[in-house]
Interface confidence: medium
Amino acid sequence: RTVPPMVNVTCSEVSEGNITVTCRASSFYPRNITLTWRQDGVSLSHNTQQWGDVLPDGNGTYQTWVATRIRQGEEQRFTCYMEHSGNHGTHPVSGKVLVLQSHW
């Protein structure tokens, strides 16, 4: 079976004009998933991102997340790239709408 992930992008303000953007994937199966931040379509370097492990969410499906810090005002340059079971998609950051949800 294949259950596509729900994708949730959030922004939280931090100090000195930087914000943390977090991309969460949830309710997906099987466990293998790709999740990374891109700037202008190019994946950010590994050491600028922080990942959570892929863990059960209690419903027979899985969840994970990736976060990075960006300059406030540059949100439109960043997207969260997700690949799962042959499907893929990009999910933007919005400086105005703090939470975006999509389901493939």
Epitope: T34, Q50, D53, V66, G86
Partner: antibody, heavy 119, light 108 residues
Framework: QVQLQESGPGLVKPSETLSLTCTVS????????VHWIRQPPGKGLEWIGM???????DYNAAFISRVTISVDTSKNQFSLKLSSVTAADTAVYYC?????????????WGQGTLVTVSS | EIVLTQSPGTLSLSPGERATLSCTAS???????LHWYQQKPGQAPRLLIY???NLASGIPDRFSGSGSGTDFTLTISRLEPEDFAVYYC?????????FGQGTKLEIK
């Protein structure tokens, strides 16, 4: 810094169980999973299996009837047990960390331990 | 299982030359789950390139990777003496998560 160290008997008799431990430092067992890989002398690498941070496991089907991978967070150790060994199980056994964001690649490795199966 | 075939089996080159190593999968592999490792005699492998084209931490930029589908390539633009080793490709697209048989890069 991140370190992984395999340990266990260097010699195991045929039909017995091979037991190895992987002691780690520099990272949390509740944050990173571990792979086990082996390499017969002079040959290539073979993936045995892995354990996730929640304790669930994925095994190579070639080993699934006789392999167990587990974790003891209190000792900072992962373990590998391989039962009913034969001479074909003679190899250097490695544990390696499953890197986050490396898409299940192995970003840090132990130095490996040679296990010889012989009577 | 997905079989990864590396070619050539042995590559003899001199320092300063360009090395091109190939990895062909028996069925399509997501570029996210194709990795390369380097192994020197008596040492454990080390992660070189992850997800087809991304350099792992501390790896010099003379190394690069490319490819998609079933055909992947590792390139070393200008060989240094420390680059002579065995190189393995590895896929985590489908279990069992297999390695290629390796390409030995030796000094000519």
């Amino acid at each position: 810094q991140v370190q992984l160290q395999e340990s266990g008997p260097g010699l195991v008799k045929p039909s017995e169980t091979l037991s190895l431990t992987c002691t780690v430092s520099g990272f949390s067992l509740t944050t990173y999973g571990v792979h086990w890989i082996r390499q017969p002398p002079g040959k290539g690498l073979e993936w045995i299996g892995m354990i996730w941070t929640d304790g669930t496991t994925d095994y190579n089907a070639a080993f699934i009837s006789r392999v167990t991978i587990s974790v003891d967070t209190s000792k900072n150790q992962f373990s590998l047990k391989l039962s009913s060994v034969t001479a074909a199980d003679t190899a250097v056994y490695y544990c390696a960390r499953k890197g986050h964001g490396y898409y299940y690649a192995m970003d840090y490795w132990g130095q490996g331990t040679l296990v010889t199966v012989s009577s | 299982e997905i079989v990864l075939t590396q070619s050539p089996g042995t590559l003899s080159l001199s320092p300063g030359e360009r090395a091109t190593l190939s990895c062909t999968a028996s069925s399509s592999v997501s570029s996210s789950y194709l990795h390369w490792y380097q192994q020197k005699p008596g040492q454990a492998p080390r992660l070189l390139i992850y997800s087809t084209s991304n350099l792992a931490s501390g790896i010099p930029d003379r190394f690069s990777g490319s490819g998609s589908g079933t055909d992947f390539t590792l390139t070393i633009s200008r060989l240094e003496p420390e680059d002579f080793a065995v190189y393995y490709c590895h896929q985590y697209h489908r279990s069992p998560f297999t390695f290629g048989q390796g390409t030995k890069l030796e000094i000519k």
